[in-house]
């Protein structure tokens, strides 16, 4: 004969455990039902009656099957340097992430503690390493034969056009100007524009530490706002 299905509440077998979505109530000494996400335990079970669940109130939530007496409070509204990427519902907490064009300069377990604007590379400098959710843009000077004429957190150095006859030679911040005949592009990396990092949920893990240096930091170390010599600018 098949084993009889036990309905909550029931006493577990000696040394046994309760089933999925059940918990052992120490007071009643019975296996009792958990409440589903979006609800909480309004009345705990007894030997003769199962858990009574109730919906979470506004601005509170439970994300898991549970037997908590009160739902958890949703976090505060997002700070003005953040955007809400997940609303507070009965089943999930609000999630705030840094605004587009910003990155998380300091992560904490609860989410991003401090958002900062992505560095913009000035004319004559291009993006060496794009910004991510947790790291700033790194700028580098445009190498000979390349230029950037924008102030941007996404543009890389582009190759100068090759002229049959050069009217004005190009430099780090300006393309070459050709006379009449149609120019060609030199063979150099084709990508011109780096997309903004897509803002998804903030990572709670800290990024790998970058090597730290004393003054005279080289171009590629993301250690604070770069000086003009390193081609970044404020807004």
């Amino acid at each position: 004969l098949p084993a009889q299905v036990a309905f909550t509440p029931y006493a577990p077998e000696p040394g046994g455990t309760c089933r999925l979505r059940e918990y052992y109530d120490q007071t009643a000494q019975m296996c009792c039902s958990k409440c589903p996400p979006g609800q909480h335990a309004k009345v705990f079970c007894t030997k003769t009656s199962d858990t009574v669940c109730d919906s979470c109130e506004d601005s509170t939530y439970t994300q898991l099957w549970n037997w908590v007496p009160e739902c958890l409070s949703c976090g505060s509204r997002c700070s003005s340097d953040q955007v809400e990427t997940q609303a507070c519902t009965r089943e999930q907490n609000r999630i705030c992430t840094c605004r587009p064009g910003w990155y998380c300069a300091l992560s904490k377990q609860e989410g991003c503690r401090l958002c900062a604007q992505l560095r913009k590379c000035r004319p004559g400098f291009g993006v060496a390493r794009p910004g991510t959710e947790t790291s700033d843009v790194v700028c580098k000077p445009c190498a000979p034969g390349t230029f950037s004429n924008t102030t941007s957190s996404t543009d890389i150095c582009r190759p100068h056009q090759i002229c049959h006859v050069v009217a004005i030679p190009g430099n780090a911040s300006m393309d070459a100007v050709c006379t009449s005949t149609s120019p060609t592009r030199s063979m150099a990396p084709g990508a011109v524009h780096l997309p903004q990092p897509v803002s998804t949920r903030s990572q709670h893990t800290q990024p790998t530490p970058a090597p730290s240096t004393a003054p005279g930091t080289s171009f590629l170390l993301p250690v604070g706002p770069s000086p003009p010599a390193e081609g970044s600018t404020g807004d």
């Epitope: 997002c78 609860e110 790291s135 530490p209």
Partner: antibody, heavy 116, light 112 residues
């Protein structure tokens, strides 16, 4: 006990650069950020910037962004602040302090005088 | 940027009497993590600033209990229950909820 010890006073000419150091002791350097604050004679406190001693992420006041660089050296538990293209109105006492949530320990201050 | 407005700018008080300094921020200082990153600093003449109060009302270690902080959102107050001679100096409120961190202009506490 926690201490932040800053480098000595500097006298600079306009257009020059200055680097102020801030050596930390008494705590794990990489677990806190460092802020830089300056105070012109007889004036209030002005926030210059913050740097994470953990990963080098930094943010500085917009008006100083083109002239200031903050760095850290975790091997010596030292933070540095370089200010370039000095002007007479950069004459101030420069302070470093520990933290980001609040600033609990401060350096003694470094007087930087910019004069021709 | 968040602007921190302190009042009064100068506060002459009698020794043993209470003193109160107000600080108002141009926008809420409540962070999405639920904390309010508002601190009070004291700067005695010729000395670096010193932390008194952090997260609105938490007293930093070694700070006498005559100092207390209160407030929420955009309005904050520092109170000294009985002013002593060593309390003379300038008091600053500061926010570190978001970049750029900002300070109030300071309130000078002097003895009448």
């Amino acid at each position: 006990q926690v201490q932040l010890v800053q480098s000595g006073a500097e006298v600079k000419k306009p257009g020059a650069s200055v680097t102020v150091s801030c050596k930390a002791s008494g705590y794990t350097f990489s677990t806190y950020g460092i802020i830089w604050v300056r105070q012109a004679p007889g004036q209030g406190l002005e926030w210059m910037g913050w740097i994470s001693a953990f990963n080098g992420n930094a943010n500085s006041a917009q008006k100083l962004q083109d002239r200031v660089t903050m760095t850290t050296d975790t091997s010596t538990s030292t933070a540095y602040m370089e200010l370039r293209s000095l002007r007479s109105d950069d004459t101030a006492v420069y302070y470093c302090a520990r933290g980001e949530d609040f600033f609990d320990y401060w350096g003694q201050g470094t007087l930087v005088t910019v004069s021709s | 940027d968040i602007v921190m407005t302190q009042t009064p700018l100068s506060s002459p008080v009698t020794l043993g009497q209470p003193a109160s300094i107000s600080c108002r921020s141009s926008q809420s200082l409540v962070h999405s993590d639920g904390n309010t990153y508002l601190s009070w600093l004291q700067q005695r003449p010729g000395q670096p600033p010193r932390l008194l109060i952090y997260k609105v009302s938490s007293r930093f270690s070694g700070v006498p209990d005559r100092f207390s902080g209160s407030g929420a959102g955009t309005d904050f107050t520092l109170k000294i229950s009985r002013v002593e001679a060593e309390d003379v100096g300038v008091y600053y409120c500061t926010q570190s909820t978001q970049f750029p961190f900002t300070f109030g202009r300071g309130t000078k506490l002097e003895i009448k």
